[in-house]
Amino acid sequence: HTAAQDNCTCPTNKMTVCSPDGPGGRCQCRALGSGMAVDCSTLTSKCLLLKARMSAPKNARTLVRPSEHALVDNDGLYDPDCDPEGRFKARQCNQTSVCWCVNSVGVRRTDKGDLSLRCDELVRTHHILIDLRHRPTAGAFNHSDLDAELRRLFRERYRLHPKFVAAVHYEQPTIQIELRQNTSQKAAGDVDIGDAAYYFERDIKGESLFQGRGGLDLRVRGEPLQVERTLIYYLDEIPPKFSMKRLTA
């Protein structure tokens, strides 16, 4: 009888099925939808989380101006194809043979096409701008306290190395968090900024992916930080390829 059998759950991903039938009675957890083994000591990739979500029962001035090439996820949920490491495949298609290319966070970066569409490589999203508006408070938050609290959150809750939180900007009521991570900077074992941003997004929406952990309770010097609107912009290492028709629409 082992500790694994007493507590066979995945602390970092509630969308898993776990059983104590791994080597030596260890707990083994697999993602819903894909059946892929997940590492419960770190964040699960966004692709596997989206796949699990789609398989689940349906019930449920100092500010940065986003670049002209920044993408916003307007397409919403889809059932993605993930590679053997859990990353998004560069080309995604739906059941009606409509295909498109995505970046490393699974956001569409080309016009939609047919099965002949080619996506040569998975383009990395190296810069993520999280744009938040907080609910009215008695006064503005202290910028350095806010900065420290958000950096702590990404370090402790999402296990993102501090060097990847490039900046925190604040101009009441807007908060912007900049995450930057080039391919060359990301070492083995580093949490991906796309995965951290997705966990943060779900936390902000009150849909925490963590197992049995309370929801996100963000406080700055004891004052609750309640977010009323979130926009996330994704910037890729190679600019997206949309037709002029879409850009002028």
Epitope: T2, A3, A4, N7, C8, G22, P23, G24, R26, C27, Q28, C29, A37, V38, D39, C40, S41, P84, E85
Partner: nanobody
Framework: QVQLVESGGGLVQPGGSLRLSCAAS????????MSWVRQAPGKGPEWVSY????????YYPDTVKGRFTISRDNAKNTLYLQMNSLRAEDTAVYRC??????????????WGQGTQVTVSS
Amino acid sequence: QVQLVESGGGLVQPGGSLRLSCAASGFPFSSADMSWVRQAPGKGPEWVSYINADGSKTYYPDTVKGRFTISRDNAKNTLYLQMNSLRAEDTAVYRCARAKLTDTHYVEDYWGQGTQVTVSS
């Protein structure tokens, strides 16, 4: 870049034997724990053997215990699976995987493309 390439699969009669190999590259093989994982049609993946980095510790589920043997040659960066007394229910795609054990959890993080093993008369 981690690469795992399996070979040795094929068609074998019930009661027969096969030896699978997995050539590893792109990571320090001699310090990595490894597993063999199989997936039968319409079923989820299941681990069938595990070996630690120096080969001193192995684990098998009851379904294959006494019939399968995992081994490794760290000088050749190669993992092996000797399968004896094969049964029809052993039919699956077999993949080698880089693995790790913690006090409580087991996880695989890289897999090969796999080699098909079919047991049929």
